[in-house]
Amino acid sequence: AFGISGVQKYTRALHDSSITGISPITEYLASLSTYNDQSITFALEDESYEIYVEDLKKDEKKDKVLLSYYESQHPSNESGDGVDGKMLMVTLSPTKDFWLHANNKEHSVELHKCEKPLPDQAFFVLHNMHSNCVSFECKTDPGVFIGVKDNHLALIKVDSSENLCTENILFKLSET
């Protein structure tokens, strides 16, 4: 969790943090679920992808997301999942050439087809939270996290360090 200094001191640096290299340092293929074990699924509808948060039937296969990890030049704080003292950012891709994007104007999370280099809206600071959970903070809007709202992914503003453990911004990663 964040230290006493809270979100503000840490997130100020996100505005001017840049990715160390244009190449990810590593990638991981995982299913993404909420703190309450609902699955994040992706459906192709009318040539675009929709993102859903739903309970899957017992033997239903979970959708996988490719997490690409990038080093930021900015040092990590206590909560960031850092490597060699550097903050980690991730992009999330459920299928080739599509990435999750933060739409800060609409407070929404969308899937967009795009080419590399990816825009800043596709990058999220990775935070390792308690109980093997992670959270994703917008690079373009510090203090704003991917969260769950009305069975959809949305962008949720977190005002204080106490709210960082709120369940609707916590996610679980698993290989199954």
């Epitope: 244009i22 340092i25 590593t26 990638e27 990890y69 490597v83």
Partner: antibody, heavy 128, light 108 residues
Framework: QVQLQESGPGLVKPSETLSLTCTVS??????????WGWIRQPPGKGLEWIGS???????YYNPSLKSRVTISVDTSKNQFSLMLTSVTAADTAVYYC????????????????????WGNGTTVTVSS | EIVLTQSPGTLSLSPGERATLSCRAS???????LAWYQQKPGQAPRLLIY???SRATGIPDRFSGSGSGTDFTLTISRLEPKDFAVYYC?????????FGGGTKVEIK
């Protein structure tokens, strides 16, 4: 800073099984975003990837060695291991363990790896 | 599998000179997933460059990588005495990952 150290017998008889262990210090295998792997280098020759593993136990092997190789992980000991069966003189090499970045190829749905932290290496000679 | 050919096999240069090492792939790959390693006698390889052009942690900026498709280059802008070693390229665009045969940079 993560460090890796190989251990195991330096001499193995032909047709027997080569077993090596890599101990990771300065970081937890379980909490790492990285993969772990084995590479070998025959005397005076180049490098050959043997295989890689994620802390969950998911493995990735070089097809040329796949039938003889098993890589396993023990997160409680912060170690991962290599077993190579039916060894011959051609398996004589310096064996390195390494931390690896794994990158995914959507086209053939496979992972490939580069190694960013290496152990010092251990020499294994196959001889009777 | 992708075959990597490094040239020249040996490069004889003096300290302070610029070294240019080439790595050519048998097939083009779009990802630029190419790494460069340095290996000194009796030591393990050390990662210099990943993603064709990103320097690994702690690598001095005299080392730079470039290239795409099938042709990649490692440049050492001003050779220091400790830079004389064997250099390997490695692709990780496709499994199995493969290494080049190496280029030895020796003191002239």
């Amino acid at each position: 800073q993560v460090q890796l150290q190989e251990s195991g017998p330096g001499l193995v008889k032909p047709s027997e099984t080569l077993s090596l262990t890599c101990t990771v210090s300065g970081g937890s295998i379980r909490s790492s975003i990285f993969y772990w792997g084995w590479i070998r280098q025959p005397p005076g020759k180049g490098l050959e990837w043997i295989g890689s593993i994620y802390y969950s136990g998911r493995t990735y092997y070089n097809p040329s060695l796949k039938s003889r190789v098993t890589i396993s992980v023990d997160t409680s000991k912060n170690q991962f291991s290599l077993m190579l069966t039916s060894v011959t003189a051609a398996d004589t090499a310096v064996y390195y363990c390494a931390r690896a970045g794994g990158l995914y190829n959507w086209n053939d749905e496979s992972f490939s790896f580069y190694m960013d932290v290496w152990g010092n290496g251990t020499t294994v000679t196959v001889s009777s | 599998e992708i075959v990597l050919t490094q040239s020249p096999g040996t490069l004889s240069l003096s300290p302070g000179e610029r070294a240019t090492l080439s790595c050519r792939a048998s097939q083009s790959f779009s990802s630029s997933y190419l790494a460069w390693y340095q290996q000194k006698p009796g030591q393990a390889p050390r990662l210099l460059i990943y993603g064709a052009s990103s320097r690994a942690t702690g690598i001095p900026d005299r080392f730079s990588g470039s290239g795409s498709g099938t042709d990649f280059t490692l440049t050492i802008s001003r050779l220091e005495p400790k830079d004389f070693a064997v250099y390997y390229c490695q692709q990780y665009d496709r499994s199995p990952l493969t290494f080049g045969g190496g280029t030895k940079v020796e003191i002239k």
